[in-house]
């Protein structure tokens, strides 16, 4: 059969039926529906809202709908024995103490189960002593203390900045620099645009707010006690101190009007440039400790907080391919929030929700997708993106081989600028061709297209007349499919104007503010985004999984894999010497590169050219474009990161959130004019050198006329 | 618009015990610390106790300590302050404030609202 | 304890005119600090936070400066109204809150 056979619709029809379906207000019904109460991972409160999809997605017309349930390590507050931080007085007493929770938003007063902030998966502890202010924590923050200012962390309690990079990275540099406590604040500077309100009267950050997040450094090994296995009913746990990426020093959240009270006291050194202040009224002083009159006072944190093996639940469901049943094209978000989740992540669950209800109709109208569409409903992702490693970990042998791509869908927006997009470089075209055919929601581009009012208000760097597409980093749900398996992923959400607001995220990110009202009220009354992101979701979705040749283009990833070879080249070329003494030659990866490029190309005339009549050739030109992003995958993975295997995107070793390219070699290279064995250090650049070289020819030969 | 309303006052005895209460409407109470501020006949203000709107912070001046206690009920929008072993130099008029804090373009400590005050006598 | 002090305790103005009352703390305060009025029988108003911020409402006429341990309050052209006790105070080092003694304004 082919895929017009698999439809009574007209098939230039499918698509724009399926996009016509697609209803705003749809959306902010569902938004409403999923917001009014906390749906915490391994809550009753999150079970139940799963069972709720569940249903309503087998009313949409899905196949079949089933829960997939797991027993992960998660965190939570001690509910008698809060969480907190005090300024202690040489006798001991507490002067001051930060709050227990955030005033809660009009409306939600007698809400109940609003978990207090905390970092998920602190330990327990009490420690006592001087602040000292690290900026945002990242590691040049760290060399900037420890190598130009001579101030030593050892011993002391650090207070982080939120912002530029993961918290999880923030708390790893904190303990690899000796302290013994941290605490993560919200700085004004990055989480209040000037000229807004705070909440409820606007969608700025109140002086009470804070954001909550986990502080895993799990490098893409899911529930902590089960890496590379699915945490199921006879599961083999590792003990807690055996456990993968848990901090080992307590870590808690506040908001900047305790910070405040905590900072204002400071003394020490003065901060070392302007880079180091927010905005507060404070001097922004490193410490350690308080100055002058404040000597004698101390910082002391109270952490109580357990972590406990809980059950979570992922829905999955089924839309069967009627010609390529054993090919899946993924589209998945998760259903668990910190708080109400107005934003993180039910923007996104509507979306989904609003997205399976209109290909359900479609399938009731007698309507099949060329291949099997799976929506994933997952859970925990605020845990450390639990639910879907573990489905995957359960799944990988099947994914792996019939893994079409993966379209992420968490937050529809963390602004209502213009839209974003991070992907694999084989679905640059599809990006682009659907955003052509979509209409721009944007003030000034009526009657434009999304594509226009994206490429002026965000242009590529690097190609006049082209949007910007950023790499895929992780912090979210196609880590494990991308990162692991090698499976093409995407994801799209609207954003925010970067040049104008430099704050971090979206001012109430992780709050308690994060509510339906914040949406309907301050981001998108009129829900236009969410319908623009259900459309470029779902339609991504729908061409991945209705098109008859796959729409990934090779010759996209031949570009972006010269453009990664320059970049990491001319970081080695900041050593000059070295790599002369080392004998240390870019060659092979320039020539490997060099030949993708050329195999690519051909593969790309023999795509136009071939018979789509014939479905055993048509299948094999697909299954080489769909195991081309396989082919990146080494499977010993990364140094010390052993499910971050794609050797050409990693997460950054310095920022989870960002992805770095040629990620080995970049690795090897930083700092390592510190290193104090530099044959050893230059001998695995080469070494990763090696690596790069022979995926990239690999990958092309798989590129190759098969016979 | 903002309300802050004092009752409570009186003639007492000294060494015998008062409640003050401040009833408090026109704004989210939930989120705000409240204070209380007496002010003798005739004399300057003294700041007597805050309460932090979460009761994670509970102060007094060194004058009461140990006498008054600050507290709040956030479901009935009150602020109380529990008067005990009054002395004659307690004798004033005690208002309840609320501070302004809230967000990064507001000061913390800072009354911005004042309620009319009630008058507490301590007198044989 | 911060001791904040005030100067004059009280003075005499005519209507139109400008005064200027100070305000010294004991020890720097950065910009954490208050002015309020009060007048007879009432509460307290918040005119001035945070040394210089106008509180919404206030006519443009009172403004604040300073900075670390000396302060002023500036009434430019006084209207009928403005005869009242003035007051500093410090949020700085709390707690204790701790007030000036109070400035009185006067009709000459």
């Known amino acids: 059969k082919s895929s017009n056979e698999a439809t009574n619709i007209t098939p230039k029809h499918n698509m724009k039926a399926f996009l016509d379906e697609l209803k705003a207000e749809n959306i902010k019904k569902f938004l409403y529906n999923f917001t009014q109460i906390p749906h915490l991972a391994g809550t009753e409160q999150n079970f139940q809202l799963a069972k709720q999809i569940q249903s309503q997605w087998k009313e949409f017309g899905l196949d079949s709908v089933e829960l997939a349930h797991y027993d992960v390590l998660l965190s939570y507050p001690n509910k008698t024995h809060p969480n907190y931080i005090s300024i202690i007085n040489e006798d001991g007493n507490e002067i001051f103490n930060t709050s227990l929770f955030e005033p809660p938003p009009p409306g939600y007063e007698n809400v109940s189960d609003i978990v207090p902030p905390f970092s998920a998966f602190s330990p327990q502890g009490m420690p006592e002593g001087d602040l000292v202010y690290v900026n945002y924590a990242r590691t040049e923050d760290f060399f900037k203390l420890e190598r130009d200012m001579k101030i030593n962390c050892s011993g002391k309690i650090v207070i982080a900045r939120y912002g530029k990079v993961f918290r999880g990275n923030k708390v790893k540099n904190a303990q690899l620099a000796g302290a013994k406590g941290v605490i993560l604040y919200s700085d004004p500077a990055d989480y209040f645009a000037p000229g807004v309100k705070s909440y409820p009267d606007g969608w700025n950050l109140p002086g009470g707010g804070v954001q909550r997040g986990n502080i895993l450094n799990l490098n893409g090994a899911g529930d902590p006690l089960t890496p590379g296995y699915p945490a199921n009913e006879y599961a083999y746990r590792r003990g807690i101190a055996e456990a993968v990426g848990l901090p080992s020093i307590p870590v808690h959240p506040i908001g900047y009007y305790d910070a405040q009270k905590l900072l204002e006291k400071m003394g020490g050194s003065a901060p070392p440039d302007s880079s180091w202040r927010g905005s507060l009224k404070v001097p922004y002083n490193v410490g350690p400790g308080f100055t002058g009159n404040f000597s004698t006072q101390k910082v002391k944190m109270h952490i109580h907080s357990t972590n406990e093996v809980t059950r979570i639940y992922n829905v999955i469901g089924t839309l069967r391919g009627a010609v390529e049943p054993d090919r899946y094209v993924i589209l998945g978000g998760h259903r668990d929030s910190w708080v109400f989740g107005g934003i993180d992540p039910q923007s996104g669950a509507a979306v989904v929700h609003e997205i399976v209800r209109s290909f359900g109709t479609l399938k009731k109208e007698g309507w099949r997708p060329r291949r099997t569409i799976l929506f994933a409903s997952w859970d925990a992702e605020e845990f450390g993106l639990l639910g879907s490693t573990e489905w995957a970990e359960e799944n990988s042998r099947l994914l792996q081989e019939r893994g079409v791509a993966y379209i992420n869908a968490d937050s529809s927006i963390e602004g209502n600028y213009t839209l974003r997009v991070d992907c694999t470089p084989l679905m640059y075209s599809l990006v682009h061709n659907l955003t052509k055919e979509l209409k721009s929601p944007d003030e000034g581009f009526e009657g434009k297209s999304l594509y226009e009012s994206w490429t002026k208000k965000s242009p590529s760097p690097e190609f006049s007349g082209m949007p910007r597409i950023s790499k895929l980093g992780s912090g979210n749900d196609f880590e494990v499919f991308f990162q692991r398996l090698g499976i093409a992923s995407g994801r799209a959400r609207y954003t925010k104007n970067w040049e104008t607001n430099k704050f971090s995220g979206y001012p109430l990110y992780h709050s308690v503010y994060e509510t339906y009202e914040l949406v309907e009220k301050f981001y998108d009354p009129m829900f236009k985004y969410h319908l623009t992101v259900a459309q470029v979701r779902g339609g991504m979705v729908f061409e991945l999984a209705n098109s008859i040749v796959l729409p990934f283009d090779c010759r996209d990833y031949a570009v972006v894999l010269r453009k990664y070879a320059d970049k990491i080249y001319s970081i080695s070329m900041k050593h000059p010497q070295e790599m002369k003494t080392y004998s240390v030659s870019f060659d092979s990866l320039f020539s490997a590169v060099k030949n993708f490029t050329e195999i690519a190309s051909k593969f790309s005339e023999r795509l136009q050219d071939f018979d789509k009549s014939n479905p055993i050739v048509l299948r094999m030109m697909n299954d080489q474009l769909m195991f081309l992003e396989r082919a990146f995958i080494d499977p010993l993975g990364l140094p010390d990161r052993p499910f971050y295997r794609h050797v050409i995107y990693a997460p950054s070793s310095h920022n989870k959130y960002a992805g770095e390219s040629f990620p080995g070699i970049y690795d090897a290279l930083f700092d390592i004019e510190s290193k104090v064995d530099p044959s050893k250090a230059w001998g695995e650049v080469k070494r990763q050198i090696y690596v790069a070289a022979f995926t990239v020819q690999a990958a092309a030969e798989t590129l190759s006329e098969v016979a | 618009q903002v309300q802050l309303v004092e009752s409570g006052g009186g003639v007492v005895q000294p060494g015998r015990s008062l409640r003050l209460s401040c009833a408090a409407s026109g704004f989210t109470f939930r989120s705000y610390g409240m204070h209380w501020v007496r002010q003798a006949p005739g004399k300057g203000l003294e700041w007597v106790a805050f309460?932090?709107?979460?009761?994670?912070?509970?102060h007094q001046a060194d004058s009461v300590k140990g006498r008054f206690t600050i507290s709040r009920d956030n479901s009935k929008n009150t602020l109380y302050l529990q008067m005990n072993s009054l002395r004659a130099e307690d004798t004033a008029v005690y208002f309840c404030?609320?501070?302004?804090?809230?967000?990064?373009?507001?000061?913390?400590?800072?009354?911005?609202?004042w309620g009319q005050g009630t008058l507490v006598t301590v007198s044989s | 304890d911060i001791q904040m002090t005030q100067s004059p305790s009280s003075l005499s103005a005519s209507v139109g005119d400008s005064v200027t009352i100070t305000c010294r703390a004991s020890q720097s305060i950065n910009n954490y600090l208050n002015w309020y009025q009060q007048k007879p029988g009432k509460a307290p108003k918040l005119l001035i936070y945070?040394?210089?911020s106008l509180l919404s409402g206030v006519p443009s006429r009172f403004s604040g400066s300073g900075s670390g341990t000396d302060f002023t309050l500036t009434i430019s052209g006084l209207h009928p109204e403005d005869f009242a006790t003035y007051f500093c105070?410090?949020?700085?080092?709390?707690?204790?809150?701790?007030f000036g003694q109070g400035t009185r304004l006067d009709i000459k």
């Open positions: 309460i932090s709107y979460d009761e994670s912070n509970k």
């Open positions: 105070q410090q949020s700085f080092s709390t707690p204790p809150i701790t």
């Open positions: 945070t040394a210089s």
């Open positions: 404030a609320k501070d302004q804090y809230y967000d990064f373009l507001t000061a913390y400590d800072t009354l911005d609202y």
